[in-house]
């Protein structure tokens, strides 16, 4: 029994991979912000975590995923406000009882020291510090990426 | 209603550097792009650059070399600093909000002149 | 750099009368996040600039509705359906897919 966010979240992830292929992104657009090999972009307004997930959909991202610690640090680290919480793309699945990222992945334990309890219509929100379980109803700013294409040499046979 | 107020020097040297500092009221610098914009006396106007509320800028390329934008969050200020000025950078200076390119807020401006 | 033309330079118009501004674009001016933006700003003699329209036709709040906006890709529109006295001013179309650029401005004044 999959849960409305869960739904949600499979919805959209599933609607992205219907839209046809765009070429790669080379650089970030403007007012989006370069981190490594992403592109993120940080809301200005507050909702709940489904809207925020939508939100992204429309700008063609995602909510922000966060591979390991040192990605989390990497992106607190342009945070300049304590105060300000932002969903990323990571909520609590009831039916398989664990943290999943909206790509379908399940939270490693030791890439996150999440602050607060595990369960249901819970979802993730990061701040300059912290990494805090919220109910995913709560009103706060979220976070949204894109890849950016690594550039490959290009190798031309001989002619 | 958010308002903005531009403030600094209305005369600057040649070579010098221009300072101009933008206070906002009615809302916080904690959200949004801030952004300067320039019109030159009778002509059009045009973008410097913005600072974004997580502190991160972006400047237009044709003056990046002279331009540095900044923010005090604790005054709700954002600054423009350019740099080796020319006659050729005397307009009126606007502060605006940006809302990814909705520039919805803006100062009444304040003329810089560049002159010996 | 993103080009903006617009045209005419100079609309003279008759009190109540309709008047049409038009921008065009060197390049499309559609974001890698899907939005257009495209917005029009109005400034009056001795007065900052004003927001009258973003993403193409998104009117900001307090602006009449005798001003609308239309367009896509490279072509853009700004129509006043009745010229009003306080309409009067410099319009300037602004793209902002790239690093924002305006356009030379339209001077809208009354015959």
């Known amino acids: 029994q999959k849960s409305s966010i869960e739904k949600c979240s499979v919805d959209i992830q599933q609607s992205r991979n219907k839209t046809t292929e765009r070429p790669g992104l080379l650089n970030c657009p403007i007012y989006w912000q370069q981190l490594r090999e992403k592109c993120l972009l940080f809301s200005h307004t507050v909702n709940p975590w489904n809207n925020s997930l939508a939100d992204c959909s429309t700008k063609e991202s995602s909510l922000l995923l966060i591979r390991d610690k040192d990605e989390l640090i990497h992106t607190q680290n342009l945070i300049r406000d304590k105060a300000i919480l932002f969903w990323i793309g990571l909520n609590f699945s009831l039916s398989e009882k664990n943290w999943k990222w909206i790509n379908g992945s399940f939270l490693n334990s030791n890439d996150l020291e999440i602050r607060g309890d595990a369960k249901e219509n819970s979802c993730i929100s990061i701040s300059q510090t912290s990494v805090y379980s919220e109910y995913c109803s709560t009103e706060i700013r979220w976070i949204c990426q894109k890849e950016l294409t690594p550039v490959r040499n290009k190798v031309y046979p001989d002619s | 209603q958010v308002q903005l107020q531009e403030s600094g020097p209305g005369l600057v040297k040649p070579s010098e550097t221009l300072s101009l500092t933008c206070t906002v009221s009615?809302?916080?610098?904690?959200?949004?792009?801030w952004s300067w914009i320039r019109q030159p006396p009778g002509k059009g106007l045009e973008w410097i650059g913005y600072i974004y509320y997580i502190g991160s800028t972006n400047y237009n390329p044709s003056l990046k070399s002279r331009v540095t934008i900044s923010m005090d969050t604790s005054k709700n200020q954002f600054s423009l600093k350019l740099s080796s000025v020319t006659a050729a950078d005397t307009a009126v200076y606007y502060c605006?909000?940006?809302?990814?390119?909705?520039?919805?807020?803006w100062g009444q401006g304040t003329l810089v002149t560049v002159s010996s | 750099d993103i080009v903006m033309t617009q045209t005419p330079l100079s609309s003279p118009v008759t009190l109540g009368q309709p008047a049409s501004i038009s921008c065009r674009s060197s390049q499309s001016l559609v974001h890698s996040d899907g939005n257009t933006y495209l917005t029009w700003l109005q400034q009056r003699p001795g007065q900052p600039p004003r927001l009258l329209i973003y993403e193409i036709s998104n009117r900001f709040s307090g602006v009449p509705d005798r001003f609308s906006g239309s367009g896509a890709g490279t072509d853009f529109t700004l129509k006043i359906s009745r010229v009003e006295v306080e309409d009067v001013g410099v319009y300037y179309c602004m793209q902002a897919a790239q690093f924002p650029t305006f356009g030379q401005g339209t001077k809208l004044e009354i015959k």
């Open positions: 605006a909000r940006d809302r990814m390119g909705a520039l919805d807020y």
């Open positions: 009615g809302g916080s610098i904690n959200s949004y792009y």
